[in-house]
């Protein structure tokens, strides 16, 4: 059985304030069953940015249809970027459970925010 990999192809992304940022993530396998979550940062302060199955994330939308069968693209788009959104974002695969169990994290994508063009 091929080992699951979570791939974040871009090490860094730069976006102008006010624009949208696309953070790319793909998984190499649908197995095991369980959600993808996006976080900013690592450790105690790790902040939940998007949960595929639950929660309310008004500025975040999935790039691909998450309900589509066999979807392995877990990229997200964050709208109306501000300097406060800068940081390193991680795409993380969980195994379904109670609670869900973290399986594999992508390497992270650093988002930097440029000043709004005048």
């Amino acid at each position: 059985e091929e080992e699951l990999q979570v791939i974040q192809p871009e090490k860094s992304v730069s976006v102008a304030a006010g624009e949208s940022a696309t953070l790319n993530c793909t998984a190499t396998s649908l197995i095991p069953v369980g959600p993808i979550q996006w976080f900013r940062g690592v450790g105690p302060g790790r902040e939940l940015i998007y949960h595929q199955k639950e929660g309310h994330f008004p500025r975040v939308t999935p790039v691909s249809d998450p309900t589509k069968r066999n979807n392995m693209d877990f990229s997200i788009r964050i709208s109306n970027i501000t300097p406060a959104d800068a940081g390193t974002y991680y795409c993380v695969k969980f195994r379904k459970g109670s609670p869900d169990v973290e399986l594999k994290s992508g390497a992270g994508t650093e988002l930097s925010v440029r000043a709004k063009p005048s």
Partner: antibody, heavy 116, light 108 residues
Framework: VQLVESGGGLVQPGGSLRLSCTAS????????MSWVRQAPGEGLEWVSA???????YYTDSVKGRFTISRDNSKNTLYLQMNSLRAEDTAIYYC???????????WGLGTLVTVSS | EIVLTQSPGTLSVSPGERVTLTCRAS??????IAWYQQKPGQAPRLLIY???SRATGIPGRFSGSGSGTEFTLTITSLQSEDFAVYYC??????????FGGGTKVEIK
């Protein structure tokens, strides 16, 4: 953002206590939360944290004795403290943790006194 | 564990003076230092993070600088409400997060 701690009090050595921190003004479930303590007349010491993903972290001196947990439906953070020692006497502050691991909002604290 | 050493332990100054507090780390922390102010009977308040970024609502007289292992908090013109204890905290290594021992700024 508001953080309100409760549950402190006087307890004998070896006893237990459960602290609570009720949060408002932000989406609680998305953020890391932490407990930081301050012994009388002393500095600040980080005790424990629960991240936005539910992972838990402890300083060495409380591992195996303290348990941090959260109820996202109640916007509440807990600290279950067992096998309490005199050196655990302190004001316990609840603090919100930023994504890069500093503390941007603090509660007023609750005093825990461990004494016979 | 990263150890933070603050100096001096106590600083006696007059209102209007410029104050510089120092925090030294036992290893490089890539500018990941935060500063807090604590007044008697109150919770700490975030002043500075990432060594030099001011937190929301913090007056411009507070500034942070430094890199590597040595960091400073400067208060350009000390106001009466600035007499307090100041703590640094490293947010580079979270196992564990650590604070300095504090510097008390008192009225001369």
């Amino acid at each position: 953002v508001q953080l309100v701690e409760s549950g402190g009090g006087l307890v004998q050595p070896g006893g237990s206590l459960r602290l609570s921190c009720t949060a408002s003004g932000f989406t609680f479930r998305n953020y890391g939360m932490s407990w930081v303590r301050q012994a009388p007349g002393e500095g600040l010491e980080w005790v424990s944290a629960s991240s936005g993903s539910g992972s838990t972290y402890y300083t060495d001196s409380v591992k195996g004795r303290f348990t941090i947990s959260r109820d996202n439906s109640k916007n509440t953070l807990y600290l279950q403290m067992n096998s309490l020692r005199a050196e655990d006497t302190a004001i316990y502050y609840c603090a919100k943790v930023t994504w890069n691991n500093f503390f941007d909002y603090w509660g007023l604290g609750t005093l825990v006194t461990v004494s016979s | 564990e990263i150890v933070l050493t603050q100096s001096p332990g106590t600083l006696s100054v007059s209102p209007g003076e410029r104050v510089t507090l120092t925090c030294r780390a036992s290893q490089g922390i890539a500018g990941k230092i935060a500063w807090y102010q604590q007044k008697p009977g109150q919770a700490p308040r975030l002043l500075i993070y990432d060594a030099s970024s001011r937190a929301t609502g913090i007056p411009g007289r507070f500034s942070g600088s430094g890199s590597g292992t040595e960091f400073t908090l400067t208060i350009t013109s000390l106001q009466s409400e600035d007499f307090a204890v100041y703590y640094c905290q490293q947010h580079y290594d979270w196992s564990p997060l650590t604070f300095g021992g504090g510097t008390k700024v008192e009225i001369k």
